[in-house]
């Protein structure tokens, strides 16, 4: 190899690289060394050049043109075929011609961003060029044609397409299989059809932040299953629907901040399983339900800072038993700190929990139970005035412990604390002052002797009457009653929750009178009037008294609506035959549901029950009782119960039972002169007619014939030899006739023959 | 003048229940914590349970968790503690005590004069 | 076997000063204030110091309390024959979630 050239003149060399930026030049320099590798020509003035000029440059694989006047992406002549980094950035280029990049055979990563390109059309970027990054951020792209990056598929990783003016992306945009980051940032895309990303199997991250979306079609993401990191920040979305996120099984990396979102819906998260982050800070939201976020058992991140939330469910978090982190910074859950218990349960692994700026006036000893691993939890920027004995005593692996507040009400319910603090070495990140009493306003917590802690009276109001819990007929008016007491003479305001929410426009009186055995004392009362109730006024109600040094909050009364049931359905009277099965039906409304109860004759132990014939079905108001015996008859009372009252309806269940003879009728001997009875004791419903016959013919009867009154007995007295014969019973009713015989022989009577021998 | 005055004390057999009061006087009682404190024959202090006013929360020693439950009523200014499967063991004066304040690590101020509970067989 | 850990006897003569350590951990002493209760043969127990060092009204100042870290103790300056009595020492323990008390120290006047 002969002597390495020398650098160009108008430029400066270190190793391969040439450094020819920043210096005017309007055009190539014209000695430029066959050894460059890495070219930079950026910051010049130059609007064309001469393909002429990259002849002799076999080496060169990175080109900086960027910061330069060129309208079009230039031919590097015989180095094109082996240039590999083309950085063409902030220049004045228009569009972009398959023909000027089909010569760059080796072309890995191409910047065009900062240009004026409007479009990209489908002969953009021809097959040949195995670009692997290619950035167009930064110009006015206002449409992207169907296809428009096919020609890259075999090899494009990353598409920067931030800073533009995109609209509207077609659906199944992009046919680039190996494409793994797609930057859609700062565009003015409105909605995401579904399947618009169909095509896109080995994306991992997809930005679309700062964009004016609205609407996630369902669908809107599905083909990503490789996808980790999704940003949707800064857009204008309202809910997260369920079906949008259908098939993101691999995302890891949700971001939604700054957007428009009211509510979480539970559906939907089912689809993202492998979740670990989730970002929904500063949105509107108002209220987390229960299991909202049920779904995402991995999920290891959630960020809910600077939204509306008031209302935290109990059981809101069931289900995230892999979250560490929980931001909830600059909300409105005072509520859920200074009463509710359980609106942490389910976070097993949390180790930090940030509450900074919630506007939490006091922490209930029961305002963090389910947190018991919990590490880091910050209350910063709270003008907390209270902390109960025992709020922070479960956490036994707390480590750091963010207190900011001068607004501490230092009596003898706070005492506990600064020995805590310091015995956990807690305090490190504690700046607590008192405002209340006046002789230590401005003092901190740990320098105030223990024997300053005293409750010489009562600032924070004490409740002393609770509402209680009631049961109310639909349409009637009820009351709820809560009284406080309180030492201080700082205005009290009332409030209601139902259901941990505040009633927001209450009926309520309220009124204040001094305290009976205490005459320095001040009694305050609130009554809540609801007016002609309905089911809409279940639930728990609560009040809320609240002055200067604190809120107390009520017990949770209860109340249940009821409506006295009525029947849809009533017992009929039936008449069936024995052994066949008998139905009846009996249904009731009422709030709460009423039970059905059967009893028979006035009692619960009857035959069909005893014998196990009965049977209940709950769903369809059907009481069977199969395999129908005569006992069954009687009069079945349907009874429907529920908290408001009883009713009943009966119906009469009648046995049909075809005659039948209970003892035998059997043959007879007597003798002339004697009584015979015969017996045709016959059973049947309805009790059946009996009729004698004599032999073919019904018998006639002689004043020495008598009957019972229902024939069921025959007694023939003076008995004649002539009474001898066939006797037949036939009992009737409308089922059918039954038959019985009986043989009556007649002998002499008896008396001595001669022989000495009786007769008889 | 505050007073506490226990009740309720007595022979019980092994396995049986029985339940003390203590009923309070000479100040809020719904405003202070209660607890209950025993003393076996010849041995020392033992806390056995105690309850927060307002809440009623609860907190009891290992040794009775499950079998002694405290319980107050306010409006009668009474306490309560509610023995059962009782053990030779739980032989003690049992003594009713109130807390300087509401919470429960507050110290205790005044005590009752105790009730004896023997379980024998 | 109690949790605060006290002598079982102490003893002094009319006069001397006589002192009653009690020993605990960090989830008791050393996180909550120490009480000192005297009592009397055949009687109730009586609060004596409170808050690791005062005295309610009418406990005379002869009796004193103080704690450094997991430790308290209780002096009895002056000591008198009335002072014949079972001293505890008592406080919270957060572990527990539960009041303990000392085992006891018997005070004898010789």
């Known amino acids: 190899a002969g002597p390495r050239a020398p650098c160009a003149a108008a430029c400066t060399c270190a190793g391969d690289s040439l450094d020819c930026g920043g210096r005017g030049l309007a055009a190539l320099p014209g000695d430029l060394p066959s050894w460059t590798r890495s070219l930079n020509l950026s910051y010049n003035k130059l609007s064309e050049i001469d393909p002429a000029g990259f002849e002799d440059l076999p080496n060169l694989q990175e080109v900086y043109l960027n910061n330069n006047e060129l309208t079009a992406v230039p031919s590097l002549g015989a180095a094109s075929s082996h240039v590999v980094s083309l950085f063409l950035q902030h220049n004045k280029i228009r569009s972009v011609e398959g023909s000027q990049l089909k010569a760059y055979l080796s072309l890995e990563v191409l910047d065009l961003s900062l240009n004026n390109i409007t479009e990209v059309r489908n002969t953009c970027f021809p097959h040949g060029p195995p670009i692997k990054e290619l950035n167009l951020a930064g110009n006015r792209i206002g449409t992207l044609e169907l296809g428009a990056f096919d020609g890259l598929s075999r090899s494009l990783l990353t598409l920067r397409l931030s800073k533009n003016r995109i609209t509207q992306l077609p659906v199944r945009a992009f046919k680039l299989p190996r494409l793994t980051q797609l930057d859609l940032n700062r565009n003015r895309i409105r909605l995401i059809e579904g399947l618009t990303f169909q095509g896109l199997n080995s994306l991992e991250v997809l930005k679309l932040q700062r964009n004016n979306i609205s609407k996630l079609t369902d669908g809107a993401f599905w083909g990503l299953s490789k996808m980790h990191v999704l940003h949707l920040e800064y857009n204008s979305l309202v809910e997260v629907n369920s079906g949008s996120l259908y098939g993101l099984t691999a995302l890891h990396q949700l971001h939604l901040s700054n957007n428009s979102i009211a509510r979480i819906h539970r559906k939907g998260w089912s689809f993202c399983q492998k979740l670990h982050e989730l970002v929904l800070s500063f949105n509107n939201l108002t209220r987390l339900d229960e299991e909202s976020l049920a779904e995402l058992s991995s999920l290891s991140v959630l960020r809910l800072s600077h939204n509306s939330i008031s209302h935290i469910a109990e059981g809101a978090f069931k289900g995230l038993r892999s979250l560490r982190v929980l931001d909830l910074d600059h909300n409105e859950i005072s509520g859920t700190i200074e009463d509710t218990s359980g609106a942490f349960s389910g976070l097993d692994s949390l180790s930090k929990l940030t509450l900074f700026g919630n506007k939490i006036k006091s922490v209930a000893k029961r305002a963090f139970s389910g947190l018991e691993g919990l590490e880091h939890l910050n209350l910063g920027g709270n003008a907390i005035r209270s902390v109960q004995f025992d709020a922070f005593v479960k956490m036994k692996n707390l480590k750091e412990l963010h207190i900011s507040s001068d607004s501490f009400l230092c009596d003898c319910q706070l005492k506990w604390l600064p020995p805590w603090l310091i015995g956990r070495m807690l305090q490190a990140f504690v700046t607590a002052t008192c405002a209340h009493p006046e002789s230590l306003k401005g003092q901190s917590i740990f320098s105030v002797p223990p024997e300053s802690f005293v409750c010489d009276d009562f600032l924070k109001p004490q409740i002393i009457t609770q509402p209680e819990t009631t049961m109310a007929m639909v349409g009637k008016d009820i009351r709820f009653t809560c009284s406080a007491a309180s030492s201080s003479s700082s205005p009290m305001t009332f409030a209601w929750k139902k259901d941990n929410e505040v009633l927001t426009n209450a009926d309520m009186e309220n009124f204040v009178h001094v305290h009976a055995q205490d005459g320095e004392v001040m009694e305050y009362t609130t009554i809540l009037h609801l007016r002609q109730v309905t089911f809409g006024h279940e639930g728990r109600y609560q009040c809320v008294i609240t002055n200067h040094f604190g809120s107390t909050y009520s017990h949770k009364a209860r109340l249940t609506v009821n409506v006295l049931p009525s029947f849809t359905k009533t017992p009929h009277d039936i008449t069936i035959r024995t052994t066949t099965m008998a139905r009846l039906e009996c249904a009731a409304t009422g709030h709460p549901n009423p039970q059905i109860a059967w009893q028979k004759d006035g009692g619960t132990d009857f035959p069909a029950a005893r014998e196990r014939r009965m049977h209940v079905m709950p769903d369809d108001d059907v009481f069977f009782i199969t395999d129908v015996k005569i006992d069954d008859a009687g009069v079945y009372s349907c009874t429907a119960q529920n908290s408001a009252g009883s009713i009943s309806a009966n119906a009469t269940l009648t046995v049909l039972e075809t005659p039948s003879l209970v003892v035998p009728l059997e043959d007879r001997v007597v003798s002339v002169g004697e009584t015979v009875a015969l017996q045709c004791k016959a059973t049947g419903n309805p009790p059946p007619r009996i009729t004698w016959f004599k032999g073919d013919r019904p018998l006639s009867l002689t004043e020495r014939h008598h009957l019972t009154p229902d024939n069921q007995l025959l007694v023939v007295q003076n008995v004649v030899a002539e009474d001898a014969g066939r006797y037949t019973c036939e009992m009737s009713n409308t089922l059918g006739t039954e038959r019985a015989h009986s043989q009556l022989s007649v002998l002499p009577a008896a008396g001595c023959r001669k022989d000495g021998t009786t007769v008889g | 003048e505050v007073q506490l005055l226990e009740s309720g004390g007595g022979l019980v057999q092994p396995g049986g229940s029985l339940r003390l009061s203590c009923a309070a006087s000479g100040f809020t009682f719904s405003n202070y914590y209660m607890s209950w404190v025993r003393q076996a024959p010849g041995k020392g202090l033992e806390w056995v349970s105690g309850i927060s006013p307002g809440d009623s929360s609860t907190y009891y020693a290992d040794s009775v968790k499950g079998r002694f439950t405290i319980s107050r009523d306010n409006s009668k200014n009474t306490l309560y503690l509610q023995m059962n499967s009782l053990r030779a063991e739980d032989t003690a004066v049992y003594y009713c005590?109130?807390?300087?304040?509401?919470?429960?690590?507050?110290?205790?101020?005044?005590w009752g004069q105790g009730t004896l509970v023997t379980v024998s067989s | 076997q109690s949790v605060l850990t006290q002598p079982p006897s102490a003893s002094g003569t009319p006069g001397q000063r006589v002192t009653i350590s009690c020993t605990g951990s960090?989830?008791?002493?050393?996180?909550?204030?120490v009480s000192w209760y005297q009592q009397l043969p055949g009687t109730a127990p009586k609060l004596l110091i409170y808050d690791d060092s005062q005295r309610p009204s009418g406990v005379p100042d002869r009796f004193s309390g103080s704690k450094s870290g997991t430790s308290a103790s209780l002096a009895i300056s002056g000591l008198r024959s009335e002072d014949e009595a079972d001293y505890y020492c008592g406080t919270w323990d957060y572990s527990l979630n539960g009041y303990v008390f000392g085992g006891g120290t018997k005070l004898t006047v010789l």
């Open positions: 005590a109130k807390g300087l304040y509401s919470n429960p690590n507050e110290p205790f101020d005044y």
């Open positions: 960090s989830s008791n002493i050393g996180s909550n204030y």
